[in-house]
């Protein structure tokens, strides 16, 4: 469950991939489409405002009692509008909602490196928001294998 | 119970070796980030080294970088520091620490070993 | 590097005194701020982190505030336990880096 209701802290940062290149949000037809680009140098790039919350991890998944905690996140990129795992199409998807976000706009965040994180499923563990064909998708990670998979490395910058 | 047990301080001689373990139990330990901490006698704190909650990625400061190698056994929740090359101002009290939160470097270290004194000196 | 600078090195108070301590950071980051108390022999305590989250078992009596470059550790009552050395540490940039302490004593 997650430690109240309110975020332990927030921040604005612009998203892009571990090769660089830039999320970035546009309104098309009343709705938000998300992309994976190159960004022309003089190009602005979008900022998205994280939400960090504390989640309790479940003792008895975790063996841990109450000693695991996990760290979620929400991002917003425009007022109302927060990005959402949807888990039947595979898909990442900016959608319009009310307080108290549902659980699949929360995503427990993984720093895989220092300057590296990566957002793994609040609804659906082991799978990762990730990179494919200049969109963002849903992709299902083998922990075993495929940990460090540069698909699903994001970088934050302020 | 969180438990984090520092051994192998001792007294070395400068350009000398030591290796330290820490002994976790009580939590999943192949969830969290692990640090290193020292503090030499009388004075602060110093970051020593982290290591990812995968081991993939290793981190030091310039000050014994080339010189420390962090590492863990997930299978035996343990962390070890190898230290060569040492110097009279690594002499400290190395503490073993976890972070907060499962997979990530956020929120302090709410855990701490007891530390393990190390003394380089001739 | 970001340089963190604690405020005052070391302080005489009493029981029962508010008692502030500052640490300013030589650039601005995240709140990822901690404090920690430490007494003699022993292993440093997390009290605070996310600049003003107290640790599970922390007495309320202290709290954490600040943003940015400024941050502040507060005890609003001081107890006989608390007469200790403390710490920042921010955890934002690398190298992690610690304030150079404030021992607090008793007056």
């Known amino acids: 469950s997650i430690t109240g209701i309110s975020p332990i802290t927030e921040s604005l940062a612009s998203l892009s991939t571990y090769n660089d290149q830039s999320i970035t949000f546009a309104l098309e037809d009343e709705s938000y489409e998300i992309y994976v680009e190159d960004l022309k140098k003089d190009k602005k790039k979008d900022k998205v405002l994280l939400s960090y919350y504390e989640s309790q991890h479940p003792s008895s998944e975790s063996g841990d009692g109450v000693d695991g905690k996990m760290l979620m996140v929400t991002l917003s990129p425009t007022k109302d509008f927060w990005l959402q795992a949807n888990n039947k199409e595979h898909s990442v998807e900016l959608h319009k909602c009310e307080k108290p976000l549902p659980d699949q706009a929360f995503f427990v965040l993984h720093n895989r490196s220092f300057n590296c994180v990566s957002f793994e499923c609040k609804t659906d563990p082991g799978v990762f928001i990730g990179v494919k064909d200049n969109h963002l998708a849903l992709i299902k990670v083998d922990y075993s294998e495929n940990l460090g998979s540069e698909n699903i490395l994001f970088k934050l910058s302020e | 119970e969180v438990q984090l047990v520092e051994s192998g301080g001792g007294l070395v001689q400068p350009g000398g070796s030591l290796r330290l373990s820490c002994a976790a139990s009580g939590f999943t330990f192949n969830n969290y980030w692990m640090t290193w901490i020292r503090q030499a006698p009388g004075k602060g704190l110093e970051w020593v080294a982290s290591i990812t909650y995968t081991g993939g990625g290793t981190y030091y400061p310039d000050s014994v970088k080339g010189r420390f190698t962090i590492s863990r056994d997930d299978a035996k929740s343990s962390l070890y520091l190898q230290m060569n090359s040492l110097r009279a101002e690594d002499t400290a009290v190395y503490y073993c620490?976890?972070?907060?939160?499962?997979?990530?470097?956020?929120?302090?270290?709410?855990?701490w070993g007891q530390g393990t004194l190390v003394t380089v000196s001739s | 590097d970001i340089q963190m600078t604690q405020s005052p090195s070391s302080l005489s108070a009493s029981v029962g005194d508010r008692v502030t301590i500052t640490c300013l950071a030589s650039e601005g980051f995240s709140n990822d701020l901690a404090w920690y108390q430490q007494k003699p022999g022993k292993s440093p305590k997390l009290l605070i982190y996310?600049?003003?989250r107290l640790q599970d078992g922390v007495p309320s009596r202290f709290s954490g505030s600040g943003s940015g470059t400024d941050f502040t550790l507060t005890i609003s009552s001081l107890q006989p336990e608390d007469f200790a050395t403390y710490f920042c540490?921010?955890?934002?940039?690398?190298?992690?880096?610690f304030g150079g302490g404030t021992k607090v004593e008793i007056k």
């Open positions: 996310a600049a003003s």
């Open positions: 540490q921010q955890g934002s940039k690398y190298p992690l880096t």
């Open positions: 620490t976890r972070a907060n939160y499962y997979y990530n470097t956020y929120g302090g270290f709410p855990y």
